[in-house]
Interface confidence: medium
């Protein structure tokens, strides 16, 4: 019963992580550049995402623009987009596998097959988590590196956006969920009759001597 609770917990965390990856992918806040001038007319914040960028004025007014082409996206965000999309697809596969291998579903009759499917689902979630943590951490690394780079103009220094924090949370949930599912050990394959058979054999052997 404790094993089933662990399984439900693992699936729930992984599904939450999967949803968080989607949010991280959609939010246009991977990189944030604040141009806070001495004047409200020229104070604006630029949000850069995987699909669009937005300008937010000091008056709260916001305008977003979808990137015209893939080439309009900086290289690191191009790579991030690819990895995050793959992560979403991989995590979706993990969700499917966890439903098939769930203790409370009847997609598979064999308990051993169910347990193995669940371990595969766990590994898939772990992979999805790694696929999110890599681009998120790489983007954060670049931002931090530029922030402390004296050659980068202060007006061009970016800050970490909310999407990065959502991405880290998503990867944490996927890794935790996947880890719990991987702990889901398959049942022992020893059958009752085999135990009786080995006991009979040992008795026969002692009688022979």
């Amino acid at each position: 019963m404790a094993s089933m609770g662990l399984q439900v917990m693992g699936i729930a965390l992984a599904v939450l992580g999967w949803l968080a990856v989607m949010l991280c992918c959609a939010l246009p806040m991977w990189r944030v550049t604040a141009f806070i001038g001495s004047n409200i007319v020229t104070s604006q914040t630029i949000w850069e995402g995987l699909w669009m960028n937005c300008v937010v004025q000091s008056t709260g007014q916001m305008q977003c623009k979808v990137y015209d082409s893939l080439l309009a996206l900086p290289q690191d965000l191009q790579a991030a987009r690819a990895l995050v999309i793959i992560s979403i697809i991989v995590a979706a596969l993990g969700v499917l596998l966890s439903v098939v291998g769930g203790k409370c579903t009847n997609c598979l009759e064999d308990e051993s097959a169910k347990a193995k499917t669940m371990i595969v689902a766990g590994v898939v979630f772990l992979l999805a988590g790694l696929m999110v943590i890599v681009p998120v951490s790489w983007t954060a690394h670049n931002i931090i590196q530029d922030f402390y780079n004296p050659l980068v103009a202060s007006g061009q220094k970016r800050e970490m956006g909310a999407s990065l924090y959502v991405g880290w949370a998503a990867s944490g949930l996927l890794l935790l969920g996947g880890g719990l599912l991987c702990c889901n050990c398959p049942p022992r394959t020893d059958k009752p009759y085999s135990a009786k058979y080995s006991a009979a054999r040992s008795a026969a052997a002692s009688n022979y001597v």
Epitope: F35, G37, N39, I40, V41, T42, I46, N53, V55, Q61
Partner: antibody, heavy 119, light 110 residues
């Protein structure tokens, strides 16, 4: 309908003072920044001063040419903006417009008030 | 300060296309957003916003007005020109403090 009505202009002596007022109506005044833009006779436009909304702590900006001489303020309860002009110079002679800052640009303009500095 | 350069005057015939240019002393674009705006001022009237962020038409402005450009070079196009469009046109940047205006381009009839 958005309306900005300026008042308080007129003739002033050099080193004298004037206080311009701008009465706003027809929009959510306390959410927007407001600026004063001037236009010398036959010349172009110059942003003189601006003031942000309460959410941005009423931050103010002054053009270098008026720093320490002009003071911008606002009264959200009355939907009013003021420009206190002290130590006036002949160069300050211009038509002064009250404008609403929408987002990097000046969305609405008043009719303007004339300020003449002459001895 | 960013200096905006406009030609002082432009003569056009009614029904023709008018192209008014504005050149900035440095780029006024950030991450694909062009922080240049256009105003129209008719004689004896206050200025009126026409175009914001280079290409967005302000509310109530007819579609014969359009804006384009990026970086340092921007254009306001009026096509076709009508008698009511005779005015002075100003560009303004909000990329850097202080915000600055161009000297204005006076649109005249040929």
């Amino acid at each position: 309908e958005v309306q900005l009505v300026e008042s308080g202009g007129g003739l002033a002596q050099p080193k004298g003072s004037l206080k311009l007022s701008c009465a706003a109506s027809g929009f959510d005044f306390d959410s927007y920044g407001v600026s004063w833009v001037r236009q010398a006779p036959g010349k172009g436009l110059d942003l003189v001063a601006d003031i942000s909304s309460k959410s941005y702590n009423y931050a103010t900006f002054y053009a270098d040419s008026v720093k320490d001489r002009f003071t911008i303020s606002r009264d959200d309860s009355q939907s009013m903006v003021y420009l206190q002009m002290d130590n006036l110079k002949t160069d300050d002679t211009a038509l002064y417009y009250c404008t609403v800052i929408a987002g990097g640009y000046l969305d609405y303009w008043g009719q303007g008030v004339m300020v003449t500095v002459s001895s | 300060d960013i200096v905006l350069t406009q030609s002082p005057a432009l003569a056009v015939s009614l029904g023709q296309r008018a192209t008014i240019s504005c050149r900035a002393s440095q780029s006024v674009s950030i991450s694909g957003f062009n922080l240049m705006h256009w105003y129209q001022q008719k004689p004896g009237q206050q200025p009126k916003l026409l175009i914001y962020r280079a290409s967005n038409l302000a509310s109530g402005i007819p579609a014969r007005f359009s804006g384009s450009g990026s970086g340092t070079d921007f254009t306001l196009t009026i096509n076709p020109v009508q008698a009511d469009d005779i005015a002075t046109y100003y560009c303004q940047q909000s990329r850097e403090s202080p915000p600055t205006f161009g000297e204005g381009t006076k649109l005249e009839l040929k």
